[in-house]
């Protein structure tokens, strides 16, 4: 499994995982104790024809062609979670691991 | 862990699964010797904010907006394998477990 | 023949509103990202705004960002620029142009159309 | 941003002469780099991209050398058509940045 990793300034244009800081704070999620901060990345780019596609299921659709079906879109092919603590609904305070909170490489699906 | 299921005649705009018979023999992949047609699923749609959206990441990049970056998209949330015989590059016939061939469910990523 | 014909330049007050077009034609259009830009009265060329072929992904100069707005209409073979709170600054002529897809990078552009001008004064 | 620097701002050549010109950048672009040509009153017409690679229809008399942050844009025998404005500009990195221009005037 391969994927592109860009940085901030690139003018790549293919489907690329890119870095994102996320901030709690600035977006007024206060219900999260910590991290305050963590690294998200995202995926961005076009997904021509063949290139980055995760599963074979995608090559398939696209010859198939039916209607209404879309190209395939760069996103997340492998995500990995972050430890957390928050406050639940009921103001309880709970420590726990949010899965897919990372992405780790992006493709073509 | 939830995703539309609509027929091919639905005017559904939102994220959705489709069902597609995928057919070897019409595409000419003729090292497949079984199953020579397959139900393979595939996604269509429309992503508009917050709907059927997999991760809280999809959320997050959202609201951080980076440079570049698309909304999510109508992609597989769940896929299963099929067991298929085939021959391979070297002519010898395999039977195995082939991942990822079968769209289960959609949502927006 | 690879053409791209801009239109929708014009007078306008200062704070006001805009919309330029670019008809494109002799190529797939979808295929190819597409950019903006400017050339202010007897200056150097300004990028302004590139959209990715299938309009997913979008990249603004920081001096446009949040009053400019790119977007393209495959179905149309057109490109778009909504240019909101114009400020004198603006003042320019707009092509746009063609991404030449020489690498996997954005920005090389091969085709460029005649420009339409924009002046914003009151 | 990077920061594209084209020197000399104005070159003074006989026609049948050589010219030189010359592009540098703040940093390292690769060979992410296009020369473009401009005369009064029309639209930029990319010449080289790829920093060594003519387009489609120019003339072997352009080329273009370099890589990373120095480049060179050489007209080997000026013609009458080639007097004008030169651009180089990079794509290597948001936001796409241009020189300021070099004039090309006969002397």
């Known amino acids: 499994d391969f994927g592109l990793d860009c940085d901030e300034h690139s003018t790549e244009s293919r489907c690329c995982r890119y870095p994102l800081t996320v901030d709690f704070e600035a977006f007024g999620w206060d219900w999260i104790i910590a991290p305050k901060r963590y690294k998200a990345n995202y995926c961005s780019g076009e997904c021509e024809f063949v290139f980055l596609q995760k599963y074979p299921h995608t090559h398939l659709v696209h010859q198939a062609n039916p209607r209404g079906s879309a190209g395939p879109c760069c996103t997340p092919t492998k995500m990995s979670p972050i430890n957390m603590l928050y406050f639940n609904g009921k103001e309880q305070i709970i420590y726990g691991k949010i899965p897919a909170m990372v992405v780790d490489r992006c493709g073509c699906s | 862990d939830f995703g539309l299921d609509c027929d091919e005649h639905s005017t559904e705009s939102r994220c959705c699964r489709y069902p597609l018979t995928v057919d070897f023999e019409a595409f000419g992949w003729d090292w497949i010797i079984a199953p020579k047609r397959y139900k393979a699923n595939y996604c269509s749609g429309e992503c508009e904010f917050v709907f059927l959206q997999k991760y809280p990441h999809t959320h997050l990049v959202h609201q951080a907006n980076p440079r570049g970056s698309a909304g999510p998209c109508c992609t597989p949330t769940k896929m299963s394998p099929i067991n298929m015989l085939y021959f391979n590059g070297k002519e010898q016939i395999i039977y195995g477990k082939i991942p990822a061939m079968v769209v289960d469910r959609c949502g927006c990523s | 023949e690879v053409q791209l014909l801009e239109s929708g330049g014009g007078l306008i007050q200062p704070g006001g509103s805009l919309r330029l077009s670019c008809a494109a034609s002799?190529?797939?259009?979808?295929?190819?990202?597409m950019s903006w830009v400017r050339q202010a009265p007897g200056k150097g060329l300004e990028w302004v705004s590139t959209?990715?072929?299938?309009?997913?992904?979008?990249y603004y100069a920081d001096f446009v960002k949040g009053r400019f707005t790119i977007s393209r209409d495959n179905s149309k073979n057109t490109l778009y620029l909504q240019m909101n709170s114009l400020r004198a600054e603006d003042t320019a002529v707009y092509y746009c142009?063609?991404?030449?897809?020489?690498?996997?990078?954005?920005?090389?552009?091969?085709?460029w159309g005649q420009g339409t001008m924009v002046t914003v004064s009151s | 941003e990077i920061v594209m620097t084209q020197s000399p701002a104005t070159l003074s050549v006989s026609p049948g002469e050589r010219a030189t010109l010359s592009c540098r950048a703040s940093?390292?672009?690769?060979?992410?780099l296009a020369w473009f040509q401009q005369k009064p009153g029309q639209a930029p017409r990319l010449l080289i991209y790829?920093?060594?690679t003519r387009a489609t229809g120019i003339p072997a008399r352009f080329s273009g050398s370099g890589s990373g942050t120095e480049f060179t844009l050489t007209i080997s025998s000026l013609q009458s058509e080639d007097f004008a404005v030169y651009y180089c500009?990079?794509?290597?990195?948001?936001?796409?940045?241009f020189g300021g221009g070099t004039k090309v005037e006969i002397k």
């Open positions: 142009a063609k991404d030449g897809r020489y690498n996997w990078n954005y920005g090389a552009f091969d085709i």
């Open positions: 940093q390292s672009v690769r060979s992410n």
């Open positions: 790829g920093a060594s």
């Open positions: 500009q990079q794509y290597n990195n948001w936001p796409l940045t």
């Open positions: 002799g190529f797939t259009f979808s295929s190819f990202a």
């Open positions: 959209i990715s072929g299938s309009g997913g992904s979008t």
